[in-house]
Interface confidence: low
C-alpha cells in the first residue's frame, strides 16, 4: 500500500499543534433525526443547516425543524429558527439555494392538511427571511431560472405549473395537468402536459409546450411525447413512433422549433433512453437493450446530436430508474469511467480517455495484488465502485471524486481483480486522470479534496465504532498523516466542505449518544496553518496531460489538441489559494482518421480506423431529414468528432446539398403547430425526474 507515516513520507512539522489551534467544535442541542447542509453563495462562508425530527402519529406526521447559520465556513453556528417563526421546513426539498452568487434562499414549509403552503425567502444570504403564503402545495423543489434568480417555477401536487416573476412574492398559474417542467436557456420554460388528466398512464400521449415569455403565450412544439430532456444546447424528446409501443429520440437545437430524428435504435415500453452526459459539443446516450437484461449500449453523438456512433456495449444500467456507474472524470478532459456487465455476468470497470472513442480496463495499481477472483494472478485490473455497488448494499461510502481545479486527481473505492468484488473495498488515487492508480487507503473511507488538490482529507468509515481521527495528505495521496480531532469519539455521519474544492476548511459531522441524550456535533478544521505560505512559481511543474509515449510527436493528443498544465509539485506544502486558476497551454495536433467519426451510412469495422459503407446502403443516395428539411448527402463517410480541434494532416472532405424540401416529422409536430395564449385544462398526476441527483442529464 502507499507509504504511511514512515521514513518515506515527509511529515508536516508540528501539524498536531497547528490543527488543534484550528479545530472548532459546535454542539447542536437538538434531538433531530436528520441534518442537511446547504452552502449559500461562493466563497461567502455561509452555511445553512436544517435539522429535522419527524414522528408519525396515527395518520399524520408531526415534525419539528431547526435552522442554523454559519458565516465562517462552519466554525460557529447561530440558531436562526426564530427568523422563520419556528416553522417546520421539509427536509426532502426544503432548502432551495439560488444560482451563482445571488444570495437567494427559499425554504419550503410543511403545512400539513392545508390546500396551500408557505415559503420563507431571503435575498441576503439568509440573514433575514420574509414569510410568503403559497396558493398551492409544491410537489418538488422550487426551481430558479438559471438566468434570473427572481424567476421561480414550481409544480404543485395537483400537477399545476406556477411561476413567480418577483422571487416568490406573487405567483401565477401557467398550466394544468403538467407532468414535467424545466427551465431552458434565456428564461424559456419547457413542459409536458396531458389533457386526459393523467401523467402516469398515458406517457406516450403527452404534448410538449414552450413559453418564452413566462406564460404570456405558449407554443406546442411536440405531440405523442413520452418524455423530454435538456442536455447542453440540445433538447431531446422521446416520441411514440406509431409502430406499436416503439418510441424514438428526436433532437432540436433551436428550442423545439425544428426537430430531427436521432439515428438511434427505437425502444419498446420496457426499455429506456438516458442522457449520461452532455455539453454544447455532444451527448453520451444510453440505449437500453430489449428484455430485462440490465445493460444497454452507449452511443456518442455528432455535433448536431443526430448521428451516433456505438461507443460501449453491455453498459451496465439496472432497472428502469436504476443505477449506472457512469462517471465524468472532471479533472481531465475526455475521461469517463463506467461499468459493463460482462458475458460471465460479472461487473467490470472501463475507462475512456478520448470522450468515448475507445474504452479499456483500468490499469492495475503498481502496489496492489490481484484478488482471489483473478484467473491469472498477474493479469487483472482495477475496478471502481460507484452507484451500482452502493445500491447493492456494499460498504462504499462515497462515489468517485474529481474536481476540475484539482487537475488529474481521481479518488475512488475499488478492488483489484477480474471484476468488481463484494469484498471490503480500498481507496485508490490517480494523479494523471485515470491512466495510473495507487492504493492510498485500506478499507472504505469518506474523502474530499481541499485547496484545489493541495490537501486530500479522509475519514475511515466505521459503522460500529466511534470516530475521532482524520487523515490528510499534502502530496496527492502518497503519504498520510493522522490527526485526532477529539478525545471522545463521535458517531460519524459525513464530511462537508464547500463545493468547488477551493476551501481550506473541512467539517466532520456526527452525533454523540448516551442513555438519556443524543445531539449533533460538528468539528470544523481549518488547514490554513498546515499550508503556511502561498505557492510560488517554483512550486509548480509542467505536466503534459494524456501523455503515454514521450517519444511520440503526437503524445498527449486527444480530440485534436494536447494540453500542458502547471501542477503543484508533490513535495511542495503551500496554499494554491481561493483565487487559484488552472494554468494550461493548449497546442493543436495534426488530424488523423481518429479525429473523425463515421457519417450516415458508414461504420468502422473492429480494430480499423477507416469508415466503410454499410453494405445495405452501398450505391444508394442518402436522404435524411435534418432541421425539418430533406437533405441530400454527398460524403466520403467522415465527420469531425465534436470538440475536436485538429488541423492539417488527414482531412476527409464532406459535402451536403440542400434540397430545401420540407419533411417535418408528423410524429413530433401536431397537425398544425399550435400557438395560443394562457389557458388551462383539468386533471392531476405526477412524474418525477428522479435522476438529477445522480448527475444524469436526463432519464426518460
Amino acid at each position: 500500500s502507499a507509504p504511511g507515516e514512515d521514513e518515506e513520507c515527509g511529515r508536516v512539522r508540528d501539524f498536531v499543534a497547528k490543527l488543534a489551534n484550528n479545530t472548532h467544535q459546535h454542539i447542536f442541542n437538538d434531538l433531530s433525526g436528520s441534518v442537511s447542509l446547504s452552502w449559500v453563495g461562493d466563497s461567502t462562508g455561509v452555511i445553512l443547516v436544517l435539522t429535522t425530527f419527524q414522528v408519525p402519529i396515527f395518520m399524520i406526521t408531526i415534525g419539528q425543524s431547526k435552522l442554523y447559520r454559519s458565516e465562517d465556513y462552519g466554525k460557529n453556528f447561530k440558531d436562526i429558527t426564530d427568523l422563520i417563526n419556528n416553522t417546520f421546513i421539509r427536509s426532502d426539498f426544503g432548502i432551495a439555494i439560488g444560482p451563482e452568487n445571488s444570495g437567494k434562499v427559499v425554504l419550503t414549509a410543511d403545512v400539513s392538511g392545508s390546500h396551500g403552503s408557505r415559503i420563507f425567502r431571503s435575498s441576503d444570504f439568509a440573514k433575514n427571511f420574509v414569510q410568503q403564503e403559497l396558493p398551492f402545495v409544491p410537489l418538488m423543489q422550487i426551481m430558479y431560472s438559471p438566468q434570473n434568480s427572481d424567476y421561480l417555477l414550481a409544480l404543485s401536487n395537483k400537477n399545476e405549473l406556477w411561476v413567480s416573476k418577483n422571487f416568490g412574492g406573487k405567483w401565477e398559474k401557467l398550466y394544468d395537468t403538467v407532468c414535467l417542467a424545466k427551465w431552458g436557456s434565456d428564461n424559456t420554460i419547457f413542459f409536458t402536459a396531458n389533457h386526459n388528466g393523467s401523467c402516469s398512464n398515458d406517457r406516450g400521449m403527452l404534448e410538449l409546450w414552450r413559453t418564452s415569455d413566462l406564460g404570456k403565450s405558449f407554443k406546442t412544439i411536440g405531440s405523442k411525447i413520452y418524455s423530454f430532456g435538456l442536455g447542453g444546447r440540445f433538447l431531446f424528446a422521446s416520441v411514440m413512433t406509431g409502430k406499436g409501443t416503439l418510441r424514438a429520440i428526436h433532437v432540436s437545437t433551436d428550442q423545439g422549433d425544428t426537430w430531427s430524428m436521432a439515428q438511434l435504435p427505437p425502444v419498446g415500453h420496457e426499455q429506456f433512453y438516458s442522457i449520461l452526459a452532455a455539453n454544447d459539443d455532444m451527448v453520451f446516450m444510453h440505449v437500453d437493450e430489449p428484455g430485462d437484461s440490465g445493460f444497454g449500449t452507449i452511443f456518442t453523438s455528432d455535433d448536431r446530436g443526430i448521428v451516433y456512433s456505438k461507443s460501449l456495449e453491455r453498459h451496465l444500467y439496472t432497472t428502469t430508474g436504476g443505477e449506472t456507474d457512469f462517471t465524468n472524470v472532471t479533472s481531465l478532459r475526455g475521461v469517463y469511467i463506467t461499468s459493463i456487465l460482462a458475458e460471465d455476468k460479472s461487473v467490470q470497470s472501463m475507462i475512456t480517455f478520448d470522450q468515448g472513442g475507445r474504452w479499456t480496463h483500468l490499469r492495475k495499481p503498481e502496489n496492489s495484488k490481484c484478488d482471489a477472483t483473478a484467473r491469472d494472478p498477474e493479469k487483472c485490473s482495477l475496478h471502481i465502485h460507484a452507484a451500482y455497488s452502493i445500491a447493492t448494499g456494499l460498504n462504499v461510502p462515497m462515489l468517485p471524486l474529481s474536481e476540475p481545479n484539482a487537475v488529474g486527481i481521481v479518488i475512488a473505492h475499488g478492488s483489484v481483480g477480474d471484476a468488481i468484488s463484494v469484498m471490503r473495498p480500498d481507496v485508490y488515487i490517480s494523479d494523471d486522470g485515470g491512466y495510473s492508480w495507487t492504493k492510498a487507503l485500506e478499507g472504505p473511507h469518506h474523502y474530499t479534496i481541499l485547496d484545489s488538490g493541495g490537501i486530500i482529507v479522509a475519514v475511515e468509515q466505521n459503522a460500529h465504532q466511534g470516530v475521532n481521527q482524520i487523515k490528510f495528505s499534502t502530496d496527492e495521496g502518497q503519504c498520510w498523516q493522522t490527526y485526532n480531532f477529539t478525545k471522545d469519539p463521535i458517531f460519524f455521519t459525513g464530511l462537508a466542505s464547500e463545493p468547488g474544492a477551493r476551501s481550506m476548511n473541512i467539517s466532520i459531522w456526527g452525533y454523540r449518544s448516551s442513555l438519556f441524550h443524543q445531539y449533533w456535533i460538528s468539528y470544523t478544521i481549518d488547514f490554513k496553518d498546515i499550508l503556511e505560505r502561498n505557492c510560488e512559481e517554483k512550486d509548480y511543474t509542467i505536466w503534459l496531460a494524456h501523455s503515454t509515449d514521450p517519444e511520440d510527436y503526437e503524445d498527449g493528443c486527444i480530440l485534436g489538441y494536447k494540453e500542458q498544465f502547471l501542477r503543484l509539485r508533490k513535495s511542495s506544502v503551500c496554499q494554491n489559494g481561493r483565487d487559484y486558476v488552472v494554468t494550461k497551454q493548449p497546442s493543436i495536433c495534426l488530424c488523423s482518421l481518429e479525429d473523425f467519426l463515421c457519417d450516415f451510412g458508414y461504420y468502422r469495422p473492429e480494430n480499423d480506423s477507416k469508415c466503410v459503407e454499410q453494405p445495405e446502403l452501398k450505391g444508394h443516395d442518402l436522404e435524411f431529414c435534418l432541421y425539418g428539411r430533406e437533405e441530400h448527402l454527398t460524403t466520403n463517410g467522415y465527420r469531425k468528432i465534436p470538440g475536436d480541434k485538429c488541423q492539417g494532416g488527414v482531412n476527409p472532405v464532406r459535402e451536403v446539398k440542400d434540397l430545401k424540401k420540407k419533411c417535418t416529422s408528423n410524429f413530433l409536430s401536431p397537425e398544425k403547430q399550435n400557438s395560443k395564449s394562457n389557458g388551462s385544462a383539468g386533471g392531476s398526476g405526477g412524474l418525477n425526474d428522479i435522476f438529477e441527483a445522480q448527475k444524469i442529464e436526463w432519464h426518460e
Partner: antibody, heavy 122, light 107 residues
Framework: EVQLVQSGAEVKKPGESLKISCKGS????????IGWVRQMPGKGLEWMGI????????RYSPSFQGQVTISADKSISTAYLQWSSLKASDTAMYYC???????????????WGQGTLVTVSS | EIVLTQSPDFQSVTPKEKVTITCRAS??????LHWYQQKPDQSPKLLIK???QSFSGVPSRFSGSGSGTDFTLTINSLEAEDAAAYYC?????????FGPGTKVDIK
Amino acid sequence: EVQLVQSGAEVKKPGESLKISCKGSGYIFTSFWIGWVRQMPGKGLEWMGIIYPGDSDTRYSPSFQGQVTISADKSISTAYLQWSSLKASDTAMYYCARHSRGSFWYGAFQHWGQGTLVTVSS
Amino acid sequence: EIVLTQSPDFQSVTPKEKVTITCRASQSIGSSLHWYQQKPDQSPKLLIKYASQSFSGVPSRFSGSGSGTDFTLTINSLEAEDAAAYYCHQSSSLPHTFGPGTKVDIK
C-alpha cells in the same frame, strides 16, 4: 408469455430420493437466474438457492447447502431440485421463480411456478 | 446473512382503510428490496421491486418506499381481495432472504 410449469405433487417415504422439475417457456431460458423457495405448512417463504441455466452456476443458502442439489438442463429449458435422502421435515410446498433481471442475481422474483407439494411421511 | 424483520405479524383491517407494513434489514441493502403478495393456496406475486417501483399490472393502491435498512409497503385503500400474506425479500447480497411475512385479513 413467460411461464414456469412445475411437476406434480409427490408423496415419499423418509430416506427416499426425489427430483422435482420446473420448465420455463416464453423467454430465453439460459439468460435468467431461476430460484427455489420453500414454504413449510403454515409458514413463510425461505430462499433455498438459485441457478443460472446458461452455465449452471449455482448459489445456495447455507441452510440448504448439502441438503439439496439444484441443477438445470438448458436443452429442455428445465430446472431441477433434488434430494438424495428425504426427511419428514422436508414436507413443504416448493416454488421455482425467475428473476426479473437477466444475467445477474440482484433482482426480484418476477415470475413464479405454481408450486410442487412434497409430502414425506412413513 | 442479512436478516429481514417485518411488522406487524398480523393485521385485521376494515375495507377502505390504509395499511402500512414495515420491513427492516439487519444491514444496509440500498434499494434491493422487493414485496410480494401471497393469497391462500396461490403462488406469491410480485408487487413492488427495488423498494418503490410498481410492477406492471399491480393496482396503484400498492406503493413502496424506503432505502438502506427501513422499508414500507402501503396499501392506500384496502379492498377485500387484498386479504393475503405479504413478504419482503432482499436481493442485495447472497444468500437472499425473505421476511417472516405479515398476514392481512378483512374485518
